[in-house]
């Protein structure tokens, strides 16, 4: 699996997205997990309805959400009030039985909102190059992850370079 | 930017314990694993454990688990790891790190080190 | 435990020549997730060790392009093309995929 980036801003909503085949897994639950590092384990966070049918219906845990389009494929996740914390390695599951299937593998990564101006810790501002178009976009920016690449870290403490 | 902080030497007893600490800083302390190891002059470095600050999640080298302990306090953002019952061939220089990214767990972040010493 | 032999144990070289680094695992080192965790780190004297190439063979950041790292299964590599002052110190490879992960015993690269 790549892994693909999802960027949101601090304080707002970012929603990711996971496609998959509806047929080959059609009836089993989905779940939202957060990996501990990129060889730690997964853990969850939420998952879809017990009701396989139901999967349409939003499910909460704090803040983050979870919803599944069964029919079309794609499985849905809200951060909301995204904050640093909420940083790292997730992956979205396909569960049957005990097993999980990896559906994707996502990088969310925060950035400082532009119109803060209070301390943003270890926020990235995003350069010219990778500004936003709208200072108010909720939904992420996503890209692929090549294997050995590292994105640049989403720090304004950047320079770290040895 | 990224700093670890480790005091510079701990001067100590055989049979007694030490609880090292490491300040993190710069960062957001509960996203990444914090790792020790233990460097012995002429004898390399060694990996004793690592822990992941949001969880407590901890991995150790079967060679140290039943004498050292690996804890952190999230709220000053302070790892430690407790070493008990030391003698001689403790006396090294300890070292916590921090993995570069979430999708580089190479070690790219070093405190400078704990001298221990254990001498009666 | 995996075992990382790392040879030569000292290297004498010239500045300017190439320099070549092994190191042998005692078993295959891919983790379960299919990434191979061997990097490489460079202890200058009385300085803190510093991370030069991670998962075989990417370069960390702000790390010269002279360093490269190689191989795959048992067997890896470390090579700098052209040596500079600033690359003497003590090489240590490192596996990162089961624990309890373990450093190489060091290869400590010198003048000629």
């Known amino acids: 699996h790549n892994t693909t980036v999802f960027q949101g801003v601090a304080g707002q909503s970012l929603q990711v997205s996971c496609p998959y085949d509806s047929m080959k897994h059609w009836g089993r639950r989905k779940a939202w997990c957060r990996q501990l590092g990129e060889k730690g384990p997964c853990q969850r966070v939420v998952s879809t309805h017990n009701l396989w049918l139901l999967s349409f219906l939003r499910r909460w845990n704090g803040s983050t959400a979870i919803t599944d389009d069964t029919l079309g494929g794609t499985l849905t996740i809200t951060l909301r009030n995204l904050q640093p914390h909420d940083a790292g390695l997730y992956q979205c599951q396909s569960l049957h039985g005990s097993e999980a299937d990896t559906l994707r593998k996502v990088l969310v990564e925060v950035l400082a909102d532009p119109l803060d101006h209070r301390d943003a810790g270890d926020l990235w501002f995003p350069g010219e190059s990778e500004s936003f178009e709208d200072a108010h976009v909720e939904h992420s920016i996503s890209r692929s992850l090549l294997e050995g690449e590292i994105p640049f870290p989403p720090t304004s403490h950047h320079h770290h370079h040895h | 930017q990224v700093q670890l902080q480790q005091p510079g030497a701990e001067p100590l007893k055989p049979g007694a314990s030490v609880k090292m600490s490491c300040e993190a800083s710069?960062?957001?302390?509960?996203n990444f694993w914090i790792t020790w190891m233990k460097l012995r002059p002429g004898q390399g470095l060694e990996w004793?454990?690592?822990?992941?600050?949001?969880?407590?999640?901890?991995n150790y080298n079967e060679k140290f688990k039943s004498r050292a302990t690996l804890t952190v306090d999230t709220s000053s953002t302070t790892a430690y790891m407790q070493l008990s019952s030391l003698t001689s061939e403790d006396s090294a220089v300890y070292y916590c790190?921090?993995?570069?990214?979430?999708?580089?767990?190479?070690?790219?972040?070093w405190g400078h080190g704990t001298l221990v010493t254990v001498s009666a | 435990d995996v075992l990382m032999t790392q040879s030569p144990l000292s290297l004498p070289v010239n500045l300017g020549d190439q320099a070549s680094i092994s190191c042998k695992s005692s078993?295959?080192?891919?983790?379960?997730?299919?990434?191979?965790?061997l990097e490489w780190y460079l202890q200058r004297p009385g300085q803190s060790p510093k991370l030069l190439i991670y998962?075989?063979?990417n370069r960390f950041s702000g790390v010269p392009d002279r360093f490269s790292g190689s191989g795959s299964g048992t067997d890896f590599t470390l090579k700098i093309s052209r040596v500079e002052a600033e690359d003497l110190g003590v090489y240590y490879c490192?596996?990162?995929?089961?624990?309890?992960?373990?450093f190489g015993g060091g290869t400590k690269l010198e003048i000629k």
């Open positions: 078993q295959n080192i891919v983790h379960s997730n299919g990434n191979t965790y």
């Open positions: 790190a921090r993995e570069a990214y979430y999708t580089n767990p190479g070690f790219a972040y």
């Open positions: 998962k075989v063979s």
């Open positions: 710069g960062y957001t302390f509960t």
């Open positions: 004793i454990g690592d822990i992941y600050p949001g969880t407590g999640n901890t």
């Open positions: 490192f596996q990162g995929s089961h624990v309890p992960y373990t």
